[in-house]
Interface confidence: low
Amino acid sequence: SGVFQLQLQEFINERGVLASGRPCEPGCRTFFRVCLKHFQAVVSPGPCTFGTVSTPVLGTNSFAVRDDSSGGGRNPLQLPFNFTWPGTFSLIIEAWHAPGDDLRPEALPPDALISKIAIQGSLAVGQNWLLDEQTSTLTRLRYSYRVICSDNYYGDNCSRLCKKRNDHFGHYVCQPDGNLSCLPGWTGEYCQQPICLSGCHEQNGYCSKPAECLCRPGWQGRLCNECIPHNGCRHGTCSTPWQCTCDEGWGGLFCDQDLNYCTHHSPCKNGATCSNSGQRSYTCTCRPGYTGVDCELELSECDSNPCRNGGSCKDQEDGYHCLCPPGYYGLHCEHSTLSCADSPCFNGGSCRERNQGANYACECPPNFTGSNCEKKVDRCTSNPCANGGQCLNRGPSRMCRCRPGFTGTYCELHVSDCARNPCAHGGTCHDLENGLMCTCPAGFSGRRCEVRTSIDACASSPCFNRATCYTDLSTDTFVCNCPYGFVGSRCEFPVGLPPSFPW
């Protein structure tokens, strides 16, 4: 489908005469008839197979014709066709004189023809105008013509239909040859497929509009190239969705069990050596001069009571020094110059001679020690209490004061948080790593099931025979309002059939 356009530019009839040579009165009021037909080697009479068009009176004798396409006029003249343009044509242009206003052929005198031209040839579809001028003895006509495709038709013969669109069925404009040219961001045969965000993973991502990247289930990230691990996975990763592969030092289904407390928390202080001893459990081996569960306490070298026989210890920069009591000498006052005759044993200790009286040894009663029974026994020096428990001397024995969550003689046992039945109103207790959780029975809520919530006693539809049920919020019980003809706490008995009471 297309249009043959003819642009009349100038007609010259200087003498104002008809083809017969007779002058027009008062001048030749000129209009044109145009015939477009198939190619003929010799243009001959016959039907105008491609169409005809007539103009109004355009001027008298000689005149120029204005291009009036923008103003809605009829120059260029339009000869539309609804077939494939064959590339060849024949064109006949007649100039006629109109004595009156009626331009119909039958209303014109037989000699009203001013001039007639006929051309034929090849014409390709295109935007460029072909300029032509035809001259006879009395007249001259200057005109130009071209063939263009109708809207939405393309190609060398205007035979290719293409309508630009930007909707669900395609996003494209048409190229001069009628092929589709996708709008930016679209691809595919009909430009229906959006081009996703650059780098969007081919399998794990998709898009419904250009430059978008929507992730399929199990994937995340701007480009949908990161898998989503199992819900609740704490210290783990995935290579496919819903996995939870634990990082080093972590274990359990959700990788939330710390198998390497030493590395993750570095609890041991002052250069102590840390040893993992189970989940969230560790032991610190202290360097000399330090003590405490985490070796956080600095020991004075005198704290170990190195001086024997009542010697007093003095801290020094490079160690310590023992000041020995009379009768003793040596680095730790370990050598005696005394004998049993000097009664060297304190606190009821009994003296035994050694080496023919050159030396002695004290046998101490319970609770005392030292070479002269001068020291009260401290049963806490070996740090017997585990898990940060505090050691207390209690006369001849010792005891451990445990940190919350631990029990046992040496605080070696974990206490279950649920052991003290913290859940009220029959709630079920669940031990968690960092505390506990209560599952409350119906009618109760709160962290410890301590909050009473009202129960809709009517929820179970306890009333019969279409009775109306009301909930007593103060007692969480129900009351049935019976319809006429029924009685009973649940309206279960018809009137006239009283229940059989046991009394």
Partner: nanobody, 120 residues
Framework: EVQLVESGGGLVQPGGSLRLSCAAS????????TGWFRQAPGKEREWVSC????????WYADSVKGRFTISRDNAKNTVYLQMNSPKSEDTAVYYC?????????????WGQGTQVTVSS
Amino acid sequence: EVQLVESGGGLVQPGGSLRLSCAASGFTLGVYATGWFRQAPGKEREWVSCISGSDGSTWYADSVKGRFTISRDNAKNTVYLQMNSPKSEDTAVYYCALSLGSSWCAYDYWGQGTQVTVSS
């Protein structure tokens, strides 16, 4: 007898203004399409502007659009061309023309012309 007489031509500086008049006798201007054409030395006659007889629609050549204005005074049977901001390339003989055919700018009857020279 149809007669068209142009006036108002002369020397004008670039950027100045000039008004050409076309007075008609022998017919009523308001019924017909009337236009202005011009011809510079050694060049073809060029259509400038046109005002239709039916509804007073106006048309202008691209070269003068926005600078020239065509108007008509039916009482005086006169058509005017107001030339604002003329350029040196507007120098030409300006002709008033009458079309008896239709509202298209044809030139059936001509005046004698008036010279316009744009120069500083």
